[in-house]
Structures are given as C-alpha cells and as structure tokens.
C-alpha cells in the first residue's frame, strides 16, 4: 500500500492504491548537496547523475576505513525520497549528487559553497530546464552562505532545505534563514510537528511550509535493494524539491516566487497542532503542510497572497523592524503586531526601488513585528496615500483617489505613545469601499494599487466589545490582500493575514478592564484579478 | 604538500615589489566585518571566505587574494588560497592565521570576512 | 509503545561464543544510536559498546575491545551484539538501550543518554 | 575514564519525607555545546532501569515533578521532594560527555 508520507501529499483526486501522479518530474534536474549516494540502488538507478564535485572535512575520530555504504546511506535515502522508483515523490526526475558531507554528515560552509558555485558555474556552460537544489543540511547562521543562496535564487535556481532538526528558531541556521530559500519543517502522520529524541523540527518565521519528515520509507544503502525509514527536516525538504519538481515540470517557465506562492496555495492548512511550538513561536510559524496541486492546469487564473513577518524590532524605544517582499512580489499591506500591545502603528516606505512594510515600537513596548502581505500580480503600479491626524473624533480618512487604482491595504502609524479608546467606535461609512479609516491621533496609510482587471472590496467584522482575537475571511475566488484593526486602539496587539483570514488580536480582556464601549473589528481587503481568470480561461 | 609551499614561496617574491607601495588602508569610509558562527563547536578557526563588494570585477578576486599572501608574507605568515570565487559571490577562501583578520579586512575591495563554519545532515 | 526486546542469552564456557539479538518496536530505529550496557552485582551497570544509526560510527568499552563486536540491521529494527572469547567476568545482565538523541551519522550529536531498555537477558561464562 | 562518584551509598525515608542523592564526576562534563551531559536513572527491583532527568535537570516524559535535577561543572543532585512507596530502588547518574559512558555506584532508596 501507499506510504503515508506520499498519500499525505496526494490530492484526494489522484488517490488509487498506487501513488501515481502525472508528470513525475521529467523536465527537471534536481541537485542533492549531500554525502555520496548509492547510484546502483534499484530506486534510483539510471535516474542519477554523481558528478565529480567533492568537498568534504576529514572525518574526526573514526576507528576505521571508509565504507561506501556506510558513506552513502543519508544522500541515498534523500535520493530515494526525491525520485524513487517505488517510493519517491517526483518519480521522473533526474537527480545529480555532490558529496558536500562526509561519513558522519559533517560539512563545511565553504565546501557548500564552492558545490554552489560548481552548480552556478554548470548553469552557465550548459544551460538547462529548471533547476532545484536540495540542501539537506543546516549549520549555524551564516551570512555568506546566505548570501550565495540568494545570487543562486536570483539566477533562476529554486533551493529547498531543512529547517533543521534542534527544535529551536530556523533563523538561527542557515541556509534555513536565507529568505530565498524554500525552508522546510517536518511533520508526521499525525500532522504534528517530528520529535527526534529530545530536539525537533525548528520552526518560526524562516520556515516556509513543513512536509512529510517522520518514518519516511526510502533507499537504504545497505544493498541495492534494501529500504529503511528514516526521519528528520533533511526528508520533508525532499518531498517539497519532488514536490518543486512536479510543478516545474507542468510550468516549467515558473519563477521562485510563482513556485513559492503555489506551494504555499495548495498546501494543507492549519493542520498542524501549534502547541508543540513555542509559545512566541505559535503565530509565525506557518500552519501549512505541503501538498501536490489537485492537477496539473495552469493555476494562473489564482491572485496568490503570503504572509511575511519580520525579525522582532528588540525592546528599544525607537527600534523598528522590517518585513520584505521577495524580488518578484508586490507588498499590497504592511501591518504591525506587538506581544505587550506597546507599538506605533506601521508604515509603507521605499527602500531601494522596493516597498518595505516598517513597525515601530512604542517606549516600554517589548518589541514589534511588521508583517508584509506579498503578492503575485503582473503588471502592478502601487502608491501609497496618507492622511495626517485628523484630530477630530470622526477619526482619520485617506482613500485611492487615482483613476484606476484600487484599495489594497490600510496602515496606521502613531507618534503618541498610547492610543486613547475610541468612543463611539468608528464603522466605515457605507458606500466607501475604498477608504481606510483610523483613530484620530494616527497617520492613516492607503496601499492603492493599479493592475489590469484588479478589484477589491472591503469586508468588515466588528464586535462591540474586545475579544481576544477577531477574524474576518475573504470568500472563494478572492484573496486576502489587507489586513488591519480598526480603529487601532491601545488594547489592540494588531492584525495578521493567516491564510485567507484576516485575525485581529487584543489583549486579554480580563486583565486590562477594558470597557464595553471600545469596540474592535477586522478589517479585510478581499481581491481579485478579472485579468487572470480571464487568462486561465484562454488557456483552457 | 611541499610543491604547493613551494609554489606558494616563489609567487610570494614575484609580488613583493609590485605589493610593497600599496597602502594597508582600505578605501575611504569603508569599513568590512567579520562574522563567525555564534555555536561554537561548531567553528572552523583558520579557514575564512573573504567576501568583496558586490560590484568587484571578476579579476580583483584573484589581485585581493595575492595582496593578501604579500602583506602576509612581509609579516612572517604563511597563507594558503584554498580556492576563489567567481560566479556566485566575488571573494576568496583562504586558510590563514586570525592574527591576518586585522590586516584582511583592510584590504580593498574586502565587503566582509567570515570565519568557516561546520554543517551537518539533517 | 517503544520496547525493546533482547534474546540468546545463556550459560557458556569460556572462550567460547553468544550473540545476543535485540528487536525494536514503537519508534523509527534508523534514527537512533543504539547501546549494549551489562549489569553485574559486583560492578554495578557497565556500558558495553554503542552503534550510530548507519553502523559508521562504533565505539567499545576497553574491557569487550578486539572480543565483542556490535552490529545492526535497520531493516529488521534489530541490534546485535556478538561476543567472542567469553571469560567469566562478562557474566552479566545484557540491556539492549535506545540513546535519547535523535543520531544523524555523528553530525552534531557528540553525547549519548539512553532513555528506554529492554528487560535484559543473562548471560553465564561458566566451565 | 570519567569517575562517577554517588553518595549516599543507601538511604532510608519516610513517605511524605524529601531526599536527596549526591553525584560528583571526575571531570567537568560541561560541553563547549552549553550542554551538561549528566542523567540519572531508577531501577526498580526486577526492573531495567529508567531515565528520570536529563542534562542535568530536564524531567524526561512521563517522570512526576516530584523529582528534580540541579548542579554543574562537576557537583550534581537529584532532589525527591516528596518520596513515595513507588520510589524504591536503585538510583545511578550517569555521564556521557565522553566514552564510555560511565555510572556511579548507586544509590539504594528504602521506605522507613
């Protein structure tokens, strides 16, 4: 019968007793940066390629000479659960071995990236189809191998790797921390994040998705015929590059952040019992396991939308943090979330030709999060339309006023260092979509943006008195691209898109003595794109 | 082993009088960093990649790595290129003393240095 | 349920051979180093010798070195230990142990601890 | 190799009553990881014995919160602050900074 991990991956659509999707991968060249492989074993055999690229540390300590098998087994699994004849993820695609790792899965930094380079190097002499890297490795943060990985991604090459095995943050590994980096965590049949011995999955903002990485069946090197289960980040990484190499495979003329954004689209949600994390881990790690496409039409038709957070501000008064959209995506909304509630709204700003969402935190605040909504839209021209404090109590307004352009996201920022309640509560007039509203000591911020056949509305869910958190979603066909709190008042931590949710956090109610006058709601700005579902349409 | 030593010594006296005028200073306001790993079993003192600014053409990697190996030498060191960068980052991989990180990171060109570090499977 | 279950314990002469089988169930045995320790009223518990997961790294107590050999089959969530040349003083209780930490090769996990054992199977070097 | 050293050799407590068991190594077992690599275990009569704490001071799962692990560098303590019938038996430290692994002597725990 099928094994878990590949039935776990698996639309229901193509469910039988056999896992046997279409397109195994045949257009791509997967890279595995790994220890050697067993390239004889029956899974495999004839479907990869070890090239000469050697750069290993000496093994420490050892007691005796070499064994290949001994050598090989972890490259050999990770093979196997790439493309495997019997239980691999992407059965058709082809698979080309570095030997970055030694015996005892020890490697350097720089002999990783010297294996880049080689990679980079055979890129440019013989240019192929698409191109993912397997880096089923982690070490210690590093800002050279990150920088590496983020040339290698800007040169067309989709890296995937294991956000590590120490049950701790991902951003404190690399490559797990390069945001060009599909990072992935690992999960078990039970959708529960994998225990391995006393560490674990590493989780938090750096990973991307997690995947099958618990009793994962696959090529053991003992013989050619031999098959073991094995567990760890290095085996749910593999399943997103044969998952990668699928969707290159049916769209090979995808970019990183178009592959990105539909894995992100088509994995399992909030599947995942976030207890097991952190407590200040839960709400940026990503509560998604990765999964193929329900087929192989193009999924052009879809605006795609994903949450980035920032790296936390750190306590100081005016510290700030920034969270960034990949090279290819548009920040439609920037938001701000604080633990301790203590924050100065968030802004839109430009940064090198790029728009980056910035929080500030507030004196005696703990720190703060911006948290980006990026998304794919061809052809998108956005501004940003501000409107200082009002001061007076019907509160701050600012709109899209350019012919064309369409609300996308609304940001408050305050100088104030707390926020007085809101009384009456502020309701967005009727007839208004376009207009972000605020509290009247903030500067109100309106992401207005121009795409062709890019529609917008908003959808508001108001309660009369906080609740802890509040939640409005986007419907079927539209996705969210703005999430905010309104009107802002100091009991509120802030607002985040999970998903297609917007969720607008206050504090606990109970131990601030709020009143039932301060009312809160979530503000969602649900889109859409006429322009590609017109497209999908002409395609099909 | 030795060959390479000796190619090394030889290579070190061509450059002298070509490296002997250049100033230790780096280019004005500039200013590279070092970074090494924050776990420290898993360091690897002793081998660094020497990273350079972005916009370096491909030939001042090689020219950086020589001016590297000259002012070394003038000060008693001996260091080895391990192996230089072209086609992902500009820069080198040297195997050095740490007692050349001061000097390192005054050479032009050098955007930061960061000390070798261990990886592992996952 | 983890459990560990050892066999082919006995009564021996000296010099002569045993090999003692442990099978496991209830957790993935791949990713764990596994351990042979003995126990004996005299010298209380005594570790005997220790395999990573793809059977690379081996390590052994002085006192079984060059007499005792440890092996695994991941295949069949076995562990092995064979011992040779048996003397008297290796009379003991045999424990097959799993190590608490996750083992990938000997990558970043350089200790041990051992969190679950088996019920043990006696062995008698006696002429 | 590394010297486990438990003390005492044998103790006798009244249920309800705290104890406590001393365990001293022959050489720090601080690794440069920030990890202290010392366990301890129980063994019940006709029993293997079974992990209490690790790294000094972690409750392994399933262990009640009456038991307790402190210590560093080369000075360790396991603490029972209220000891029940169940308690009884053989309880060793072990070190595992460096191979082989070692244990102390044992400490034998009776009801009064």
């Known amino acids: 019968s099928i094994p878990w991990n590949l039935e776990r991956i698996t639309p229901a659509r193509y469910r039988a007793d056999e896992y046997q999707p279409p397109k195994g991968g045949s257009l791509v060249e997967v890279y595995l940066l790994d220890t050697s492989i067993q390239s004889d074993h029956r899974e495999i055999e004839g479907r990869v390629m070890v090239t000469d690229f050697e750069s290993v540390p000496e093994e420490d300590g050892t007691r005796f000479h070499r064994q290949a098998s001994k050598c090989d087994s972890h490259g050999t699994h990770l093979a196997g659960v790439v493309s495997g004849r019997d239980a691999g993820v992407a059965k058709g695609a082809g698979l080309r071995s570095l030997r970055v790792l030694n015996c005892q899965g020890k490697g350097t930094v720089s002999g990783t990236l010297i294996g880049l380079e080689f990679i980079r190097k055979s890129q440019l002499v013989q240019p192929v189809g698409p191109l993912v890297v397997l880096l089923p490795l982690a070490g210690g943060y590093s800002r050279v191998f990150n920088a590496a990985c983020q040339r290698l991604a800007r040169a067309g090459v989709v890296l995937v790797t294991a956000a590590g095995n120490f049950r701790d943050d991902a951003c404190l590994y690399s490559p797990a921390s390069a945001p060009e980096v599909i990072t992935v965590g690992a999960t078990n049949a039970q959708d529960q994040p994998v225990t391995l011995g006393t560490l674990g999955t590493n989780f938090g903002r750096c990973v991307d998705l997690f995947a099958p990485g618990e009793d994962i069946i696959g090529a053991s090197s003992d013989c050619s015929t031999c098959f073991v289960s094995r567990s760890g980040t290095s085996q749910a990484a593999a399943h997103v590059a044969g998952i990668a190499a699928m969707m290159l495979s049916a769209e090979p003329e995808l970019t990183l952040a178009e592959l990105r954004q539909r894995l992100i689209h088509f994995s399992a949600k909030d599947v995942i019992n976030e207890a097991w994390f952190p407590e200040d881990q839960r709400v940026l790690t990503p509560n998604l396991v990765a999964a193929l496409p329900p087929s192989t039409h193009r999924a052009g038709w879809q605006l795609f939308c994903r949450t980035v957070w920032s790296a936390h501000s750190g306590p100081t008064r005016m510290a700030t943090a920034v969270a960034r959209c990949a090279q290819d995506e548009e920040l439609l909304s920037c938001s701000s979330f604080s633990r301790s509630g203590k924050r100065r709204g968030e802004r839109i700003e430009a940064q090198g030709g790029k728009r980056v969402c910035r929080a500030h935190n507030a004196f005696g605040g703990e720190g703060v999060y911006a948290i980006a909504r990026c998304c794919l839209l061809p052809q998108v021209n956005c501004s940003v339309h501000t409107a200082p404090p009002a001061g007076a109590s019907m509160g701050t307004r600012v709109h899209c006023h350019q012919q064309g352009h369409v609300l996308t996201g609304c940001s408050s920022h305050w100088e104030v260092e707390d926020l007085g309640t809101h009384k009456p509560p502020v309701l967005r007039p009727r007839g208004q979509p376009n207009q972000c509203v605020g509290h009247r000591e903030a500067s109100i911020h309106a992401s207005c943006c121009h795409a062709p056949g890019l529609e917008c509305k908003v959808k508001e869910h108001g309660i009369p008195a906080p609740q802890e958190q509040v939640i409005v979603a986007c419907e079927d066909g539209w996705t969210l691209t703005g999430c905010s709190a309104l009107p802002g008042t100091s009991h509120v931590l802030g607002a985040y898109a999970v998903d297609n949710t917007c969720v607008v956090r206050s504090r606990d109610v109970s131990t601030t003595g709020s009143t039932s006058e301060e009312a809160v709601a979530a503000v969602a700005i649900c889109c859409r794109s006429r322009h590609l579902v017109q497209a999908s349409q002409e395609l099909q | 082993q030795e060959d390479e030593d000796g190619d090394y010594e030889e290579l070190v006296l061509a450059l002298r009088s070509e490296e002997d005028g250049l100033a230790d200073a780096p280019e004005h306001g500039a200013t590279a960093t070092f970074h090494r790993c924050a776990k420290d079993p898993w360091r690897l003192p002793g081998t660094y990649v020497v990273v350079l600014k972005e916009e370096t053409h491909r030939s001042q990697s090689e020219r950086t790595a020589r001016r590297l190996q000259a002012q070394a030498a003038r000060r008693g060191y001996l260091t080895k290129i391990l192996h230089v960068f072209h086609h992902l980052l500009p820069g080198f991989l040297v195997k050095m003393s740490g007692d050349l990180l001061e000097l390192a990171l005054k050479l032009p060109h050098v955007d930061y240095i960061e000390e070798d570090s261990s990886v592992f499977a996952q | 349920e983890v459990q560990l279950v050892e066999s082919g314990g006995g009564l021996v002469q000296p010099g002569r051979s045993l090999r003692l089988s442990c099978t496991a169930s209830?957790?993935?045995?791949?990713?764990?180093?596994m351990h042979w320790v003995r126990q004996t009223p005299g010298k209380g518990l005594e570790w005997v010798s220790g395999?990573?997961?793809?059977?690379?790294?081996?390590n052994y107590a002085d006192s079984v070195k060059g007499r005792f050999t440890i092996s695994r089959d991941n295949a069949q969530n076995s562990l092995y230990l064979q011992m040779n040349s048996l003397r008297a003083e290796d009379t003991a209780l045999y424990f097959c142990?799993?190590?608490?930490?996750?083992?990938?090769?000997?990558?970043?996990?350089?200790?041990?601890?051992?969190?679950?054992w088996g019920q043990g199977t006696t062995v008698t070097v006696s002429s | 190799d590394i010297v486990m050293t438990q003390t005492p050799l044998s103790l006798s407590v009244t249920p309800g009553q705290p104890a406590s068991i001393s365990c001293r190594s022959s050489?720090?077992?601080?690794?440069?990881?920030?990890?202290?690599?010392l366990y301890w275990y129980l063994q019940k009569p006709g029993q293997p014995p079974q992990l209490l704490i690790y790294?000094?001071?972690n409750r392994f799962s399933g262990v009640p919160d009456r038991f307790s692990g402190s210590g560093s560098g080369t000075d360790f303590t396991l603490k029972i602050s209220r000891v029940e019938a169940e308690d009884v038996g053989l309880y060793y430290c072990?070190?595992?900074?460096?191979?082989?692994?070692?244990f102390g002597g044992g400490t034998k725990v009776e009801i009064k």
């Open positions: 142990a799993k190590d608490i930490t996750y083992d990938l090769l000997t990558g970043y996990n350089y200790n041990y601890g051992l969190d679950v």
């Open positions: 209830g957790f993935t045995f791949a990713d764990y180093v």
């Open positions: 395999i990573s997961w793809n059977s690379y790294s081996i």
């Open positions: 050489q720090s077992l601080l690794h440069s990881d920030g990890k202290t690599y």
């Open positions: 790294e000094v001071s």
């Open positions: 072990m070190q595992s900074i460096q191979l082989p692994l070692t």
